[in-house]
Structure formats: structure tokens, C-alpha cells
């Protein structure tokens, strides 16, 4: 379950089953959300383009202690080929825009659903 960044990148990308599992997990998060997700933590917005998985992980990895997104962090880590640590930032972040984790998850989910519908997973 590794890739060289995002769907627009050359090389291996997550197969359809892995993408479907990530989508299902994000759906689960949005549907089961009661209190503010991750206590309303804010994360950097990202460009949903090439290198999306690593950029998403770089953003979400700065959220600690949020059990709701632990599995998502694990999955994104599996999709990103390089080591990502908290406090690490790439040019893929929209560095002047922070959004709530809940909104980040919704945006990511919408984008992944679109890619899945278009068959962009192999």
C-alpha cells in the first residue's frame, strides 16, 4: 500500500480496494461525528492534486490524541512513500489557510469519491 505521492504521480498508486477503504473510513468519521471532531483542532489546508496523500498526512499528523482519525493517519502513512513527522511542511500546503479537521476530512472525502468515480486508482 504505497504510492509515489498522489494519483497524478507516475508509478504505483493505491489500488481500488485501498482507496475504497480510505473512503469508507472518512465516511465513517463524518457520519459518526458527535462533538467537534478532534476537539475542533485546526490543520493546514492542502492542494488536492499530485502528492495529495503525503500532503494530507503532513497536515493531519500534527493532530495528536484524536482517536477518530488514528486509522486515517495510519492509512495515509501507508500511502505516502517517505517518512512524515509532525511539524513537517511541504509546498503542497496552502500555508495561509487553516481549517477544522472536520472540514479537512469532508474536502478530502469529496475529492477521493470523485477520483474513485472517475476510476483514477490504477
Amino acid at each position: 500500500l504505497t504510492c509515489l505521492g498522489g494519483f497524478a504521480s507516475p508509478g504505483p498508486v493505491p489500488p481500488s480496494t485501498a482507496l475504497r477503504e480510505l473512503i469508507e473510513e472518512l465516511v465513517n468519521i463524518t457520519q459518526n461525528q458527535k462533538a467537534p471532531l478532534c476537539n475542533g483542532s485546526m490543520v493546514w489546508s492542502i492542494n488536492l492534486t499530485a502528492g495529495m496523500y503525503c500532503a494530507a498526512l503532513e497536515s493531519l499528523i500534527n493532530v495528536s490524541g484524536c482517536s477518530a482519525i488514528e486509522k486515517t493517519q495510519r492509512m495515509l502513512s501507508g500511502f505516502c512513500p517517505h517518512k512524515v513527522s509532525a511539524g513537517q511542511f511541504s509546498s503542497l500546503h496552502v500555508r495561509d489557510t487553516k481549517i477544522e479537521v472536520a472540514q479537512f476530512v469532508k474536502d478530502l472525502l469529496l475529492h477521493l469519491k470523485k477520483l474513485f468515480r472517475e476510476g483514477q486508482f490504477n
Epitope: 504505497t2 483542532s41 495528536s64 490524541g65 513527522s85
Partner: antibody, heavy 118, light 111 residues
């Protein structure tokens, strides 16, 4: 800087309950997970349970019926309560904070020693 | 529950030599391409200290003499070369599944 400090009764009579407080500083409990780990004298480490920043609580299934973990984020305190103590519960009890993903236990308190004896 | 079995229970290594500690899990601790196995060092009278996370990543501030390897069920902690200050008990720990579990520990003595 990150600090954790456990405080407990020291001595507990058999069949009684144990209450330990972990008071933290240098970070917020709303965005951090706190674990409870114990270590009997001369023995290894045993994970008791944890409370996530968002409130979820996970317990060691073997001890779940005797354990209760809670917190008061506004006071920066995490609480461990254990019922029906016996001699083999004698141990040093640690609280430890997870780091960021992948949630290994990065920061530890010095621990508090608990002896179960009449 | 995932049971972690460490070997040997104790070992004595000469100063400057290599120490190798093993940890075997009763089932895989891998998830999405990562191994959720961590290593700690505990010196006498002190709390444990994280050395290695995700099987092979060195925690900040830990000397490069420490290294970790392995995947799925078999993991290794290596100290090379061993220094006098390394005398301690070392524990592996998994958090791939709840409950989190520790290995029984390996006591390292420096000769």
C-alpha cells in the same frame, strides 16, 4: 516543557480501592493521549489503559472490570481508579503521554509507588 | 491480546561490542505498511525512555548506535557499539491492537 507527575496514597489495604492523579503541564489534555502503565518491583511493564485527547478510553481487557480512567482537562489532571486491590497490585504506577502519530509513549512521569498491605 | 516474547532475558556484552535483542509477536503488528512496534530503555530507578518507534525510526536525541529492524512478528534492537551507559532493561511494545502490550524485558549488562 512537558511534565507529568503522579500522586497516590502510597499504601492501600487489601480489597480497598486505589486512586492516583496524574497532573500535567506544558501541554493540553484536549490534544494529547495519556496512558497508565505499572511495574511491580523487579518485574516488567504492564499497560493498564489510556484516555485520548478526544475522550475515548481504552482499557487492558484483563483489568477492565477493576479500572476507571477519567480526566479533568481544565485542571490538567488525569485520574486512575482501581478497585479490589490485592498484594500483586503492588507496583510503581506511571502516567505517560503519547507523542504524535504513531502514538508511542514519549513522555513519562517519575511514577508513584503503591504498596498493597494490611 | 498480542503477546510479545523477548529474548534473551538477559545478556552481558563487552564494551565496544554489539548487543542484539529480539522481540517476537504472537501475531503481526503491521498495519498499512508500517510496523507498530516500539523500543524503550529503562535504567534503574528511572521511567522508560523511548528509543525506536515504528520498528526502525530513531527517536529524537537518541544516539545512532541504537537501531531497530523487523516487520510483522519478528523484530530486533541492536546497540553497536555498546557503551557503559547503556546498562539497562530494554522493552519492546506494540500498539497495533488494543490492549497495548509490552515484552517481558531484556536486561543488558556491560562487561
Amino acid at each position: 516543557q512537558v511534565q507529568l507527575k503522579e500522586s497516590g496514597p502510597g499504601l492501600v489495604a487489601p480489597s480497598q480501592s486505589l486512586s492516583i492523579t496524574c497532573t500535567v503541564s506544558g501541554f493540553s489534555l484536549t490534544g494529547s493521549s495519556i496512558n497508565w502503565v505499572r511495574q511491580p518491583p523487579g518485574k516488567g511493564l504492564e499497560w493498564l489503559g489510556m484516555i485520548w485527547g478526544d475522550g475515548r478510553i481504552d482499557y487492558n481487557s484483563v483489568l477492565k472490570s477493576r479500572l476507571s480512567i477519567s480526566k479533568d482537562s481544565s485542571k490538567s489532571q488525569v485520574f486512575l481508579k482501581m478497585n479490589s486491590l490485592q498484594a500483586d497490585d503492588t507496583a510503581r504506577y506511571y502516567c505517560a503521554r503519547d507523542g504524535y502519530y504513531p502514538y508511542a509513549m514519549v513522555y513519562w512521569g517519575q511514577g508513584t509507588s503503591v504498596t498493597v498491605s494490611s | 491480546n498480542i503477546v510479545l516474547t523477548q529474548s534473551p532475558a538477559s545478556l552481558a556484552v563487552s564494551l565496544g561490542q554489539r548487543a542484539t535483542i529480539f522481540c517476537r509477536a504472537s501475531e503481526s503488528v503491521d498495519s498499512y505498511g508500517n510496523s507498530f512496534m516500539h523500543w524503550y530503555q529503562q535504567k534503574s530507578g528511572q521511567p522508560p525512555k523511548l528509543l525506536i518507534y515504528l520498528a526502525s525510526n530513531l527517536e529524537s536525541g537518541v544516539p545512532a548506535r541504537f537501531s531497530g529492524s523487523g516487520s510483522r512478528t519478528d523484530f530486533t534492537l541492536t546497540i553497536d557499539p555498546v557503551e557503559a551507559d547503556d546498562a539497562a532493561t530494554f522493552y519492546c511494545q506494540q500498539n497495533n491492537e488494543n490492549p497495548r502490550t509490552f515484552g517481558g524485558g531484556t536486561k543488558l549488562e556491560i562487561k
